[in-house]
């Protein structure tokens, strides 16, 4: 069998459009594909952040590809040409790789970058990120946050910083239209008169960092002599009922503690006639049907039912938060 040598694509490069980690990989067709004019060649593209164990592999007929990367690390990529099986008349094909790398030249020592970056998407409505200044940075250091997601023309800077001692330590984001279920990119860079400050890059999806409001309107209903139904309502806001999981804490007569996780806004509790007091609190979290992760809400106000006979439905609402 003869062997065909096929060149790799030309001008293979990684281009940074300024989207804080969303990069373009692009190339041109290989030289001298004259023998294969009738064939639709494909390209096998492999890429990863440097230090990652696995390559991501794409096969495409296009001359470009886009994906997100962690710009705190370098990126390596390689590409070669593939010929369709039917094109080669049984000949073996040797296809060499073109390789390229990309990284942002780091400024400043790692300790100068922001510490303990924490972002929460409150009630699927308000994004707030906070951080601590880098270790050993002077008071003249200030940090700036930039963000981008698909749908924005360019990266935007935070316009509502949270400050402490004149330094930016957080950002309150504006309304973010059509921003969930896609990668959300953040860069926090800094400036100082005295020394360069290392930039930090973060990527997450907003639906995975939601902290809902606590459930409301907690009530009791006697179902039978030995069953009480606990009910509550979803909090106000954009999160639909199908997206919630709940955790309940129930105390009977200040001793028995029952905890349960449920998917609906009700829980049926077995009780005895001796029960004198019943209190419960509920908290909510976005479930696996709507996100890959989430943050538990605060506990609801405590709702208690007291009296000689629970069936009299004597309700006492305690307006302090349970911790």
């Amino acid at each position: 069998d003869t062997e065909i040598k096929v060149n790799p694509p030309q001008d293979f490069e990684i281009v940074d459009p300024g989207y804080l980690g969303y990069l373009y990989l692009q190339w041109q067709p290989p030289l001298s594909l004259d023998h294969f004019k009738e064939c639709t060649v494909e390209y096998e593209l492999k890429y990863r952040n440097i230090g990652s164990e696995t390559w991501k592999t794409i096969i495409t007929k296009n001359l470009h590809y886009k994906d997100g990367f962690d710009l705190n690390k370098g990126i390596e990529a390689k590409i070669h040409t593939l010929l369709p099986w039917q094109c080669t008349n049984g000949s073996e094909v040797q296809s060499s790789w073109a390789e390229t790398t990309y990284w942002i030249s780091p400024q400043g020592i790692p300790e100068t970058k922001v510490q303990d970056m924490d972002c929460v998407y409150y009630n699927w409505q308000y994004l707030l990120c906070s951080w601590k200044p880098g270790i050993g940075v002077l008071l003249d250091t200030n940090y700036n946050l930039f963000y981008w997601y698909e749908g924005l023309d360019h990266a935007l800077q935070c316009v509502d910083y949270i400050k402490a001692d004149g330094q930016n330590i957080g950002c309150r984001f504006p309304y973010l239209e059509a921003s969930d279920y896609k990668d959300f990119y953040i860069c926090v860079n800094g400036s100082s008169e005295n020394k360069p400050i290392r930039s930090s890059y973060f990527t997450f999806q907003l639906q995975n960092i939601v902290k809902p409001l606590p459930p409301v309107y907690l009530t009791f209903t006697r179902e039978s002599s030995c069953e009480i139904k606990l009910k509550w309502s979803i909090p106000l806001g954009p999160i639909p009922a199908r997206c919630f999981d709940y955790e309940i804490e129930i105390r009977e007569d200040d001793t028995t503690l029952v905890t349960a996780t449920v998917e609906n806004e009700t829980y049926t509790l077995k009780t005895t006639n001796e029960t004198r007091q019943l209190c419960f609190v509920v908290r909510s979290k976005v479930n696996i049907y709507c996100s890959d992760d989430g943050i538990w809400s605060e506990w609801s106000d405590k709702q208690c039912w007291e009296g000689e006979d629970l069936s009299k439905k004597t309700l006492l609402r305690h307006h302090h938060h349970h911790h």
Partner: nanobody, 115 residues
């Protein structure tokens, strides 16, 4: 005629399982690298899993621990066991046979994960 034929796709609820098969004809697959790719709407084909001639396997990060690739050389067939399926696994799944710089594709089988 050399060809690959996938089967086993279908519709399943989140958390469900499917087993895809890829039968080769006109070629003996025992000495070839075999792979599963998938292609979502408007996306490029991305590698899901890869198996060498001596059955060493590699998986994309997004399926590790959920999918298992295997091969039965005597039956000239490649398999993909898919457990813990998620809505984002919805795609057309293709098997591919690799030999150097040439590639043979199957026609694909549709997997839909929806509640």
């Amino acid at each position: 005629q050399v060809q690959l034929q996938e089967s086993g796709g279908g519709s399943v609820q989140p958390g469900g399982s499917l087993r895809l098969s890829c039968a080769a004809s006109g070629i003996n697959i025992s000495s070839d690298v075999m792979e599963w790719f998938r292609q979502g709407p408007g996306e490029q084909r991305e590698l899901v899993a890869h198996i060498t001639t001596n059955s060493r396997t590699e998986y994309a990060d997004f399926v590790k621990g959920r999918f298992t690739i295997s091969r039965a050389n005597a039956k000239n067939t490649l398999y993909l066991q898919m457990n813990g399926l998620k809505p984002e696994d919805t795609a057309l799944y293709y098997c591919a046979l690799r030999r150097g710089g040439r590639i043979l594709w199957g026609q694909g089988t549709q997997v839909t994960v929806s509640s």
